[in-house]
């Protein structure tokens, strides 16, 4: 089955300062976003390989990319307060994958010492209803029914 | 305020050709990668097109060579030229975004019936 590894699990970094987010597959993608969890859900970025990739205006002109949408590296960089919060990659095939989520805690520079990454991943809790990391059906049609649908290829 | 207003449809003999469009806002169209999905009575809804940002495709095999998706990042809208029609076909089509786990809105829909 398809999977996605995300790397960080966690990282702290100063005001100002840039992180790297890595997402890999072994393949067979249509396009990877990066999607910024909380209690609505931000689009950051859509990447596929031979498009402009699209950046969500909050990030424009902070966001590089390397690599390709099978091993794709992205860099936010001038990083604020505002954008502490979980990221998780989700690649785009015929069904839902999600990486593990990165925990990316920007804080005050003197504060440093007061907000550290642990080495375990991220809460399960902390990310989408789906469960991480695994392949699933279509969710608009399964929210969509009263019933599951059984599971199936799509387009 | 998310919004997807469909329009298009109607009754056309087998064999015969559909366009149906979508209005899209509230939203990142940009960003989305988005699909048309139909429902028949008494069956589950199903994705049967979808088109990425970069307009790249992807058809159920059911569609493949007869239907076509198409997207206008500028006018926000999505369209599904529907060629070759055959009674199969006939169900309330609709847009949304595809392969998406937080985004929960529908719209009307547009009835599609293929009849002789």
């Known amino acids: 089955a398809q999977e996605v590894q995300q790397s960080p699990h966690c990282t702290t970094v100063p005001v100002g300062a840039s992180v790297n987010i890595t997402c890999s597959t072994s393949g067979g993608l249509r396009g990877i976003y990066l999607r910024q969890l909380g209690p609505q859900p931000q689009d950051i970025i859509y990447y596929e390989d031979g498009v402009v990739p699209t950046t969500d205006r909050r990030f424009r002109g902070r966001i590089d990319f390397s690599g390709s949408q099978d091993n794709l590296t992205i860099t936010m960089h001038r990083l604020q307060l505002s954008d502490t919060g979980t990221y998780t990659c989700q690649a785009i095939t015929e069904v839902n994958v999600y990486g593990s989520g990165t925990l990316v805690l920007v804080t005050e520079e003197q504060s440093q010492g007061w907000h550290r990454c642990s080495d375990a991943p991220p809460r399960a809790s902390a990310l989408p209803a789906p469960p991480t990391g695994s392949a699933l059906p279509d969710p608009q049609t399964a929210s969509a029914l009263p019933d599951p649908p059984a599971a199936s290829a799509l387009p | 305020q998310v919004q997807l207003q469909e329009s298009g449809g109607g009754l056309v003999q087998p064999g015969g050709s559909l366009r149906l469009s979508c209005a899209a806002s509230g939203f990142t169209f940009s960003m989305a990668v988005m699909g048309w999905y139909r429902q028949a009575p008494g069956k589950q809804r199903e994705l049967v097109a979808t088109?990425?940002?970069?307009?790249?495709?992807y058809y159920v095999d059911s569609v493949k060579g007869r239907f076509t998706i198409s997207r206008d990042n500028a006018k926000k809208t999505v369209v599904l030229q529907m060629n070759n029609l055959e009674p199969e076909d006939a169900a309330v089509y609709y847009c949304?975004?595809?392969?998406?786990?937080?985004?929960?809105?529908w719209g009307q829909g547009t009835q599609v019936t293929v009849s002789s």
């Open positions: 088109i990425t940002p970069g307009g790249n495709t």
């Open positions: 949304n975004r595809a392969y998406d786990t937080h985004y929960d809105y």
